[in-house]
Interface confidence: medium
């Protein structure tokens, strides 16, 4: 599938709201750069079941991003 | 009750243009990506081209970039799919669907066709040589 190879948001609209937490396999924070001036949270689910945004504007996003910043800094 | 109802196909020769539309009902537009797939007799479906209504950001399949525009009329609910210089592979059924939280990724079925929310008929193009 050769599609869209260039540096941009990979979210196409806001997100769903949330997924269910037996669902995730990893969440991923883009944070704003110059390919993407907004934070995307992006779920991969299991069972290769593909990918997700999450809503940064939501609880569950909100929640995550605080647990990965929590984790790395 | 959400509708997504495709207009615009037809016949068409080789070289020529056509608008696709999808008038939207029943769910709030902006919340989700709209997007055009196309399915070729014996081929499985694939994207075409998808938009977010909520900031209209655009992205294409190779095989249409360059040739195809997708744009949304968030007053009406209704994506185009506006198809020029077009070629007889083009021949399919095109369907517009939409779903909230995709990735635009090596392809727009990051989602898994069955996890798009809604679906509209499919509007047949048919472009002869």
């Known amino acids: 599938f050769p599609m869209f190879k260039r540096g941009r948001c990979l979210c196409i609209g806001p997100g769903v709201k949330a997924v269910k937490v037996a669902d995730i396999e990893k969440a991923s924070i883009m944070y704003p750069s110059n390919n993407c001036d907004k934070i995307e949270v992006i779920i991969t689910l299991k069972e290769n079941k593909g990918q997700r945004c999450l809503n940064p504007k939501s609880k569950q996003a909100r929640l995550i991003i605080k647990k990965v910043e929590r984790k790395n800094f | 009750e959400v509708q997504l109802v495709e207009s615009g196909g037809g016949l068409v020769q080789a070289g020529g243009s056509l608008r696709l539309s999808c008038a939207a009902s029943?769910?709030?537009?902006?919340?989700?990506?709209m997007c055009w797939f196309r399915q070729a007799p014996g081929k499985e479906r694939e994207g075409v081209s998808c938009?977010?209504?909520?900031?209209?950001?655009?992205y294409y399949a190779d095989s249409v970039k360059g040739r195809f525009t997708i744009s949304s009329d968030n007053a009406k609910n209704t994506v185009y799919l506006h198809m020029n210089s077009l070629k007889p592979e083009d021949t399919a059924v095109y369907y517009c669907?939409?779903?909230?939280?995709?990735?635009?990724?090596?392809?727009?079925?990051?989602?898994?066709?069955?996890?798009?929310?809604?679906w509209g008929q499919g509007t047949q193009v048919t472009v002869s040589s």
């Open positions: 669907a939409a779903a909230q939280g995709v990735v635009a990724g090596a392809s727009l079925v990051w989602v898994p066709l069955d996890e798009y929310d809604y």
């Open positions: 029943g769910f709030t537009f902006d919340d989700y990506a």
């Open positions: 938009i977010s209504s909520s900031d209209g950001s655009t």
